[in-house]
């Protein structure tokens, strides 16, 4: 039975040219995290595997940095980076948990963090 919940940084905004940390946290379960995928709807950004370490997709290598922790840092942001990001936690024995973050990249300096939210 899956008892865990994913807490994410929720809806966030950042300035064009800046950087942002995408962060998820799995709680309320003793399941072992064996892999975390960072994805957009149509492409994989990065994977952190407990045995193999980090893998960054070649199309993001220049501006994605692993961490902190199981999170992901996006750099040199463009307006095209606006959209949904998913953290997919592969766990044993629970299975797969997913969190969602919506990032808006702004032209001006009005970027500020939104509220936190949970996906069960």
């Amino acid at each position: 039975m899956m008892t865990g919940t994913i807490e994410t940084t929720g809806n966030i905004s950042a300035e064009k040219g800046g950087s942002i940390i995408l962060q998820c946290h799995l709680s309320s379960t003793t399941a072992q995290v064996t892999q975390v995928n960072w994805e957009q709807q149509d492409q994989l950004l990065a994977i952190c595997n407990a045995d193999l370490g980090w893998h960054i997709s070649p199309s993001f290598k220049d501006r994605v940095a692993p961490g902190p922790g199981l999170g992901l840092t996006l750099q040199s942001l463009t307006v095209n980076d606006t959209g949904e990001y998913f953290c997919i936690y592969h766990t044993y024995p629970d299975g797969t948990y997913t969190g969602r973050i919506f990032l808006e990249v702004l032209e001006s300096s009005v970027a500020e963090h939104g509220a936190r939210f949970q996906i069960p």
Partner: antibody
Framework: QVQLQESGPGLVKPSQTLSLTCTVS?????????WNWIRQPPGKGLEWIGY???????RYNPSLKSRVTISVDTSKNQFSLKLSSVTAADTAVYYC???????????WGQGTLVTVSS | DIQMTQSPSSLSASVGDRVTITCKAS??????VAWYQQKPGKAPKLLIY???YRYTGVPSRFSGSGSGTDFTLTISSLQPEDFATYYC?????????FGQGTRLEIK
């Protein structure tokens, strides 16, 4: 439990437009996920055609992009495939499928055979 | 596009046998590979995702392994209901692509 069901003509003439609909039950297609079309020519492998996401964004296979349109009818909880200028090479079983965030496909319709022939 | 090449294309085996099907990607896909089982006239069924994670309800005799470009689906002890065609799929980048299939037949 989500269920998907394809429907549409089983026979299309060459140069015409193939039109199929996928009716989804047990889940609102505007709530989440991406809704895909995948095809399989007789006796051959699977080919991903494209998707429409719950928010209306589309992504198509570049090999078919110039001929493909995927759209949604929210009132009927359906999404549709249109493939223009068909030839015999488009004869296939067409499946609709729901993608997981990680881009694997846990949920499929039963498939519908479309034959392109005059 | 990333090409997925399966081998063998067909395989004969007996109930109780251990069977291995391989899939080779044309470029590094890390662990982003899924496996499906398809029976005649039916839709594919998801068995494995992210190279080694069994989907809900899939029997433990099915296992996946591999990373980079080389992946394996293993059935530890074939059951009568396992005779089918198996496909690998890369879920690394669009367009998502499938192998050509491996047909598993009764010997």
């Amino acid at each position: 439990q989500v269920q998907l069901q394809e429907s549409g003509p089983g026979l299309v003439k060459p140069s015409q437009t193939l039109s199929l609909t996928c009716t989804v039950s047990g889940y609102s297609i505007t709530s989440d996920y991406a809704w895909n079309w995948i095809r399989q020519p007789p006796g051959k492998g699977l080919e991903w055609i494209g998707y429409i996401s719950y928010s209306g964004n589309t992504r198509y296979n570049p090999s078919l992009k110039s001929r493909v349109t995927i759209s949604v009818d929210t009132s009927k909880n359906q999404f549709s495939l249109k493939l223009s200028s068909v030839t015999a090479a488009d004869t296939a079983v067409y499946y609709c499928a729901r993608k997981y965030y990680g881009s694997w496909f846990p949920y499929w319709g039963q498939g519908t055979l479309v034959t392109v022939s005059s | 596009d990333i090409q997925m090449t399966q081998s063998p294309s067909s395989l004969s085996a007996s109930v109780g046998d251990r069977v291995t099907i391989t899939c080779k990607a044309s470029q590094d896909v890390f662990t982003a590979v899924a496996w499906y089982q398809q029976k005649p006239g039916k839709a594919p069924k998801l068995l494995i995702y992210s190279a080694s994670y069994r989907y809900t309800g899939v029997p433990s005799r099915f296992s996946g392994s591999g990373s980079g470009t080389d992946f394996t689906l293993t059935i530890s002890s074939l059951q009568p209901e396992d005779f089918a065609t198996y496909y690998c799929q890369q879920h690394y980048s669009t367009p998502w692509t499938f192998g050509q299939g491996t047909r598993l037949e009764i010997k």
